[in-house]
Structures are given as C-alpha cells and as structure tokens.
Interface confidence: medium
C-alpha cells in the first residue's frame, strides 16, 4: 500500500491526531489534502516545521496561500520564522521576523494566543 492509499484509509481518523502522528505522516508521502489539514487540531499543527508541512501536504502545499487567514494555517504561520516561510515560495506573510528570539512561555502564549518575541 502506498502513502496515498494509506492516507485514504486513515483520513477520517485524523481530526484528533497528535503532533507526533502528523510528523510521522509527513515522512510517508501521503499528500494530505487541504480540507483534511484545515480540520486538524491547531495545537497539533503548531509545532510542525515548514519542511514537515511541505512534506505532509505534497502538491497541496501550494494551496496554503488561499488559507493563510484561516485556522490552523494562520496560527501556524505566526509560529514560523519568516525566512522559513519564504522558502515555500507562496508569499505567506506574518511569520517571526529574522533576528527575533522565540521564548516558549506557555502561560504568556495561553493568555495572548501568540508567542512571546524578543527583538534583535
């Protein structure tokens, strides 16, 4: 069974998938469609790197531009370095500016909904 066929079998169970499962899927050439990606738990998507999302979505990564204002894509963008987002070649904006440090202050983030940044 190839990655695409495997994905079809597990698609209906993915809504509640944890980050670890999504990271594992990104290594299996599954080409997750955007409709499924948009239904994933935001907290599971946020830790994914740009490279992992690109591998997870395959050709569908090109559709992220259309979803950049919607969750979980919007929140995921806010967590990525702008330099990394730029490598996708999709014109996604809103990432962490180059030179900023991201502090993983869970309480701060829980209150504000955004990561705490320290300027250069």
């Amino acid at each position: 069974m190839n990655g695409s066929e495997y994905f079809v079998k597990i698609q209906s169970f993915l809504g509640g998938a944890p980050t670890e499962d999504l990271k594992a899927l990104s290594q299996q050439n599954v080409s997750m469609d955007l409709a499924t990606f948009m239904k994933l738990r935001t907290d599971a998507v946020l830790p994914l790197t740009v490279a992992e999302v690109q591998k997870l979505l395959g050709p569908h990564v090109e559709g992220l531009k259309a979803e950049e204002r919607h969750r979980p894509v919007r929140d995921w963008i806010l967590r990525q370095r702008q330099d990394d987002l730029d490598t996708l070649g999709l014109g996604l904006q809103g990432g962490i500016p180059n030179g900023y440090l991201v502090l993983d202050l869970s309480m701060q983030e829980a209150l504000s909904g955004t990561p705490c940044l320290l300027g250069p």
Epitope: G3, S4, E5, V8, N29, S31, D33, A35, G58, P59, H60, E62, G63, K65, A66, D86, T87, L88, G89, L90, G91
Partner: antibody
Framework: EVQLVQSGAEVKKPGASVKVSCKAS????????MHWVRQAPGQRLEWMGN????????NYNEKFKNRVTITVDKSASTAYMELSSLRSEDTAVYYC?????????????WGQGTLVTVSS | DIVMTQTPLSLSVTPGQPASISCKAS??????IAWYLQKPGQSPQALIY???YRYSGVPDRFSGSGSGTDFTLKISRVEAEDVGVYYC?????????FGGGTKVEIK
C-alpha cells in the same frame, strides 16, 4: 493580467540539450510555483515537474528525473526548463503554467507553448 | 502513478444537445480534479477545478461532478465553440497526471 511568454521553437539533434524559457508578468512571480507540462503529437498532456521560485527547490516526474532541470531567475521573473539527452520521442510542445493562482487549484494560465523538434 | 482514464475517446454532438465525458482515477483522489479544453492549435484552457467549481468566465453550460475515483464533465448544450479535446487532471499527488483526452466534434 497574467501573462506567460515562452521562448521560440527549437530544432535539436538527438543527444543534444534544449533550454526553454518562460517569462511571467501580471502577478507576484515568487508567490506561485511554476510547472512544466509537455504534449507530444497526438499524446496526452504530461507533467514534467515544478519549481518553487522563491527557494529554487523543485519536484520532478520520475520519468524525466535524470534529464530535466527546472530553474528560475527571480530578478527576471523567468522560469527555465532544460531537457538533456534528447531523443525523437521528446518532440513535443512544452508549456509553462503556474498552479493555484488566485487561490484556485489547477492550471488557470498557460504559456503559448514552445515546439521542440528532435530530428537527425 | 495515478492513471486517469477518460471515456469516450471521441464524441460527435449535434449543436444544442448535451454531452458527457467520464474520467476514472486508478486510486482515490478526493475532489482534486481539474478539467481543461484544448482547442485546435491553442494552449489548454481551464474549465473546472476541485471537481465541480467553474473558473471565472467559464459558461454555466459546463458542469463537473464526482469524487473519489469517478468524475464527469457535462456540457448541457454543446455549441460550435466547444470543439476540441477535453482533459481531466489530478493534482492529488505527485506526479500530477492527465487523462488521455476526449475529442468533441460537432455533427
């Protein structure tokens, strides 16, 4: 208005290489991936690969993987497709087409096509 | 690779009559399908995306349906300008693949 202007027709000998250009205008070149599709006489359309204009990263159809190279010149908003070790079966019209422009998947815009004839 | 199989190979239609083209994918592609029309001597032009959505400027006599592996393009009333070769294409996974085409002619 989106425009894709390709280089002119080419006649090549078997074993040679050809490099076709595609100059894009009317949209942000680095925000949409550029794809190349070819059509041999009387044959179906055949996807060759694509390029991320921001990073230069590419995906290729395995059928062409060792012979095709897709590149970009960001400053000139131009994509290139080079095919090496040409054989008679490579005689075809080659098209460039960006994907997902205007947030809609599919190839909504195509270049005018470049006829490459391989003949001894 | 996902193989896209179109039927029929050709279609001869009286103006004003309907036409229907089928496209079958060798594996599930969801609704990640587009349809194109290639008129003689021209580049392909996009008609339908996501299986059933018309691109702007495409007449409403064109409609698409289907999901999974079976898809259909319908022309409610064929006009002279609709002649050409129609292609389906999947963009569900790499490599992107096209159907073999259906040639539509006017009787």
């Amino acid at each position: 208005e989106v425009q894709l202007v390709q280089s002119g027709a080419e006649v090549k000998k078997p074993g040679a290489s050809v490099k076709v250009s595609c100059k894009a205008s009317g949209y942000t070149f680095t925000s949409y991936w550029m794809h190349w599709v070819r059509q041999a006489p009387g044959q179906r359309l055949e996807w060759m690969g694509n390029v991320n204009p921001s990073s230069g990263g590419s995906n290729y159809n395995e059928k062409f993987k060792n012979r095709v190279t897709i590149t970009v010149d960001k400053s000139a908003s131009t994509a290139y497709m080079e095919l090496s070790s040409l054989r008679s079966e490579d005689t075809a019209v080659y098209y460039c087409a960006p994907h997902y422009i205007g947030s809609r998947p599919g190839f909504a815009y195509w270049g005018q096509g470049t006829l490459v004839t391989v003949s001894s | 690779d996902i193989v896209m199989t179109q039927t029929p190979l050709s279609l001869s239609v009286t103006p004003g009559q309907p036409a229907s083209i089928s496209c079958k994918a060798s594996q599930n592609v969801g609704t990640n399908i587009a349809w194109y029309l290639q008129k003689p001597g021209q580049s392909p032009q996009a008609l339908i995306y996501s299986a059933s959505y018309r691109y702007s400027g495409v007449p409403d006599r064109f409609s698409g349906s289907g999901s999974g592996t079976d898809f259909t393009l319908k022309i409610s009333r064929v006009e002279a300008e609709d002649v050409g070769v129609y292609y389906c294409q999947q963009y569900n996974s790499y490599p992107l693949t096209f159907g073999g085409g259906t040639k539509v002619e006017i009787k």
